[in-house]
């Protein structure tokens, strides 16, 4: 094949080699960019910056080599459009540093930086960590920091990510209240900070205020949906990113629901309880306190991480006719009390049938459902039996 006279020439089915001295000063408009999986660049002393726009359209790129060139700066978001990048060779350029953000989100199997005048500072703590952990082939390169010594020896005691403290209200928060959160950010070289509120949706009206090092957040007219939702403060410096999540507990009265008994391994009377703080529960059977045993007991399902409602069963192990009757679940917290009742018939009384009647072969429970989910005022003298905390 005739030698390729262009600055960049095809290499294999999806590769490109740009090796003609000084032919490039940027990577805009590379031919066939959208299908490239491999890009090799060498001897491009005018190629000094690698920015987001340079690699736009190179979504299939897996191997990028820029060597013996003039690269001085790689933007933190330079590889945003190349998520499949797995090998990155930037050796023998003029890089003094490389941000942790540059490689964040990539699954790099190989990162080559040897032959650059790296300067050891906390901004390279992430690279030192790669060296310590044997990642990306970094240890084999024995990277040196210009004027200082091996990267491995860089002192790092002061190279921490930001420290975050989020202040939440001590006092009880009620539905409709306004809540002020404050995120105090400490640390060296702070760059950016903010709030992540993706879980909040319609739980409150959000107003942000302030900036580094103290960020404010007002949650106005909060609803009970705010419970168990993460409010996250984040901050970044040249070392990395820190996040702290808090939850605001919005008080609301207990509520309860009972459902028709179902036969599973044991019989189950399904229930749902809600409230903040988590209500305590008591069961009544035919109006009297039900003492739980290994045959009749409360069992909770695994709670959902982002909601206060708890689901569970009153489990009955091989109930007989003596267990037929009216089951009431009482739920109470400091803001109110609620109850729900259900009739359950597990088995007919074998001693109450007419000898003339045909003997029944199977039974299905006959339930009548009466639920009063509205909170009622808590009276201290109400007699309660077994107490189960919902946490």
């Amino acid at each position: 094949a005739a030698p390729c006279p262009d600055a960049c020439c095809p290499h294999g089915s999806s590769g490109l080699r740009c090796t003609r001295d000084g032919a490039l000063d940027s990577l805009h408009h590379l031919p066939g960019a959208e299908n490239l999986t491999e890009l090799y660049i060498e001897n491009q002393q005018h190629l000094q910056h690698l920015e987001l726009r340079d690699l736009r359209g190179l979504g299939e790129l897996r191997n990028l080599t820029i060597v013996k060139s003039g690269l001085r700066f790689v933007a933190p978001d330079a590889f945003h459009f190349t998520p499949r990048l797995s090998r990155l060779n930037l050796s023998f350029n003029a890089l003094e540093s490389l941000s942790w953000k540059t490689v964040q989100g990539l699954s790099l199997q190989e990162l080559v930086l040897s032959g650059n005048p790296l300067h050891c500072s906390c901004a390279l703590r992430w690279l030192q960590r790669w060296e310590e952990e044997g990642l990306g082939g970094v240890p084999e390169q024995k990277l040196q920091c210009h004027g200082q010594g091996p990267l491995a020896h860089m002192p790092n005691a002061s190279c921490g990510v930001p420290t975050l403290k989020v202040q939440v209200p001590n006092a009880s928060v009620d539905v409709g209240d306004d809540v002020l959160l404050r995120c105090q950010v400490e640390g060296r070289g702070l760059e950016q900070a903010g709030w992540i509120l993706t879980e909040l949706e319609q739980s409150a009206t959000v107003m942000k205020s302030g900036g580094l090092p103290s960020l404010g957040l007002t949650l106005a007219n909060v609803t009970s949906d705010l419970n168990r939702k993460n409010v996250t403060c984040w901050a970044e410096n040249d070392v990395g990113r820190a996040e702290v999540s808090v939850q605001v507990n919005v008080s609301f009265p207990a509520s309860v629901q009972l459902h028709t008994a179902v036969e599973m391994h044991h019989w189950c009377i399904p229930f749902s309880v809600d409230g903040q703080p988590a209500p305590s529960l008591r069961w009544l059977f035919n109006g009297s306190v039900l003492n739980e045993t290994s045959f009749i007991f409360t069992e909770f399902l695994e709670p959902a991480a982002n909601e206060t409602v708890r689901h569970g069963c009153l489990r009955l192990n091989q109930p007989t006719h003596v267990n037929n009757g009216n089951y009431t679940l009482l739920a109470a917290n400091p803001f109110g009390q609620a109850s729900a009742s259900i009739m359950a018939a597990f088995m007919d009384n074998p001693f109450e049938f007419n000898p003339e009647d045909p003997i029944p072969v199977s039974f299905s429970p006959v339930d009548t459902n009466s639920t009063s989910g509205d909170p009622v005022e808590k009276k201290d003298e109400t007699p309660f039996g077994v107490s189960v905390a919902v946490g």
């Epitope: 005048p117 300067h119 040196q144 004027g147 002061s158």
Partner: antibody, heavy 119, light 106 residues
């Protein structure tokens, strides 16, 4: 013990060049970066540049780009700093100093070489 | 380049005094280094990585600070402490020095 011994005082005319030497002993010369710092009379300290004798990799303060040349002779464990196109404001004491990476600081300094630029 | 500002540029103190020298960097640095220099002599490393005393430095000296503000403190000034003290950073390239603080006898 680790020692850096520098060449003697020099008097030069403006426009001339001067080459200051720094002989190292007591440690592995090729594995530590050597730096050069100067101090004008009654003034503070100013960094000139650095060289890694192991591979002669070097870099200079932008202020001295093109005028300061750093070299190293590993056979004699000697580092050199040559400053060309001298002017009167280059009159200063020139120091070599080792960057000790185990504790990450300039731990040993030469005694200094006085360079006077005068017509 | 990171600028290093030392204050005061000179101070007069008596033997036994507590002396504090401050160094402010134009942007955040990881560590601060201090050197002592006496007339006609090369600088001597005095405090490295903010708070570590170099070999032979008396325990009356201490260093502290973080971010942009750092301090060298002499708890009880002795006759041999009269000298000029320089701060230096090597967090950012190139290394830069403060203008010096001359500690003189009152």
């Amino acid at each position: 013990q680790v020692q850096l011994v520098q060449s003697g005082a020099e008097v030069k005319k403006p426009g001339a060049s001067v080459k200051v030497s720094c002989k190292a002993s007591g440690y592995s010369f090729t594995t530590y970066w050597m730096h050069w710092v100067r101090q004008a009379p009654g003034q503070g300290l100013e960094w000139i540049g650095t060289i890694y004798p192991g591979n002669s990799d070097s870099s200079n303060n932008q202020k001295f780009k093109g005028r300061a040349t750093l070299t190293a002779d590993t056979s004699t464990s000697t580092a050199y700093m040559e400053l060309s196109s001298l002017r009167s404001e280059d009159t200063a004491v020139y120091y070599c100093t080792r960057f000790y990476y185990e504790d990450w600081y300039f731990d040993v300094w030469g005694q200094g070489t006085m360079v006077t630029v005068s017509s | 380049d990171i600028q290093m500002t030392q204050s005061p540029s000179s101070l007069s103190a008596s033997v036994g005094d507590r002396v504090t020298i401050t160094c402010s960097a134009s942007s955040s640095v990881s560590y601060m280094y201090w050197f002592q220099q006496k007339p006609g002599k090369a600088p001597k490393p005095w405090i490295y990585r903010t708070s570590n005393l170099a070999s032979g430095v008396p325990s009356r000296f201490s260093g502290s600070g973080s971010g942009t503000d750092y301090t060298l403190t002499i708890s009880s000034l002795q006759p041999e402490d009269f000298a000029t003290y320089y701060c230096q950073q090597y967090h950012s390239y190139p290394p830069t020095f403060g203008g010096g603080t001359k500690v003189e006898i009152k």
